[in-house]
Interface confidence: low
Amino acid sequence: FERTRSLQDPCSNCPAGTFCDNNRNQICSPCPPNSFSSAGGQRTCDICRQCKGVFRTRKECSSTSNAECDCTPGFHCLGAGCSMCEQDCKQGQELTKKGCKDCCFGTFNDQKRGICRPWTNCSLDGKSVLVNGTKERDVVCGPSPADLSPGASSVTPPAPAREPGHSPQ
């Protein structure tokens, strides 16, 4: 099959780093500077990505692979292939339209990116707060007071189900 395909389509023999040049009897020509082809059989080479401004070059473009960008210090990548750079904030902050703002009470952010998230509600898991939360750190939940009292059962029976809108019988 490959042989037949090659005879029918001379371009399939062109390796990555070249393109099938129709202007030159479909011979494989090397990609010109600032362009690349990452797969064989291509009829054109793609223009290399340029890492400018807030982007900086993580990997140079080569004839077979595109340049890869990352972000200058103080920024971090967003999107596939680092398509955007977003400003870093400090831990305990989140990025808003007006810049970096401290997390509101009851929320935290332990990274330089992303949004402030609510502290874990320990009581939802039947636990108590062992270490208070801060802007930078979530609360640490510990065992519930009942778990610590002597003779307490380790298994709590479930409360009876109540349908909304109905009074207990």
């Epitope: 780093g17 500077p33 400018k52 990997k59 140079e60």
Partner: antibody
Framework: QVQLVQSGAEVKKPGASVKVSCKAS????????MHWVRQAPGQRLEWMGW????????TYADDFKGRVTITRDTSASTAYMELSSLRSEDTAVYYC?????????WGQGTLVTVSS | DIQMTQSPSSLSASVGDRVTITCKAS??????VAWYQQKPGKAPKLLIY???IRHTGVPSRFSGSGSGTDFTLTISSLQPEDFATYYC?????????FGGGTKVEIK
């Protein structure tokens, strides 16, 4: 034609700083990045860093971080490389080189001698 | 950092000889290799970039080949002005690194 003309030779004492200039002509200065490379006597070429001449953002080789500062003056089409805390092993010829898929044009070199 | 190892470190040849210099990268650098010529007391001059593309004004007797980790600079018929030191350099990743050089001397 493209030309890069560097400042003259310098003799410095250990601990001092040196600033080498590189004046570009024959092309649009901000269209190409400028790299700095040095060569100690009888040694291989050693890359020091480069500057994005459009934005002014420098990138330094790890071996020189904290000691080298690369800047540019677009109005004068000139790049600068300053090396501080000089020691005897910094004695070398320092080159600027325009970059276009490779270092395609080089300055004539500036000999910096560090001696007490 | 990527290491570029050139061989031989020096060679003696006569005018008209075919000369081959090799450069081996410590990891795949695709085709992102350049070759430079340097004469004593002078700045390097670019000969070849992207492994095989001759720079403007470089004579056709200079050719480059290779990809991945193995690269070759060939001078098809050595001329008197070709006696110099030749360096390879990868530009695939930062920092760009140079080979140790090959000195071509007159036999």
């Amino acid at each position: 034609q493209v030309q890069l003309v560097q400042s003259g030779a310098e003799v410095k004492k250990p601990g001092a700083s040196v600033k080498v200039s590189c004046k570009a002509s024959g092309y649009t200065f901000t269209d190409y990045s400028m790299h700095w490379v040095r060569q100690a006597p009888g040694q291989r070429l050693e890359w020091m860093g480069w500057i994005n001449t459009e934005t002014g953002e420098p990138t330094y080789a790890d071996d020189f971080k904290g000691r080298v500062t690369i800047t540019r003056d677009t109005s004068a089409s000139t790049a600068y490389m300053e090396l501080s805390s000089l020691r005897s092993e910094d004695t070398a010829v320092y080159y600027c080189a325009r970059y276009d898929y490779a270092m395609d044009y080089w300055g004539q070199g500036t000999l910096v001698t560090v001696s007490s | 950092d990527i290491q570029m190892t050139q061989s031989p470190s020096s060679l003696s040849a006569s005018v008209g000889d075919r000369v081959t210099i090799t450069c081996k990268a410590s990891q795949d650098v695709s085709s992102a290799v350049a070759w430079y010529q340097q004469k004593p007391g002078k700045a390097p001059k670019l000969l070849i970039y992207w492994a095989s593309i001759r720079h403007t004004g470089v004579p056709s007797r200079f050719s480059g080949s290779g990809s991945g980790t193995d690269f070759t600079l060939t001078i098809s018929s050595l001329q008197p002005e070709d006696f110099a030191t030749y360096y390879c350099q990868q530009r695939y990743t930062t920092p760009p690194t140079f080979g140790g050089g090959t000195k071509v001397e007159i036999k």
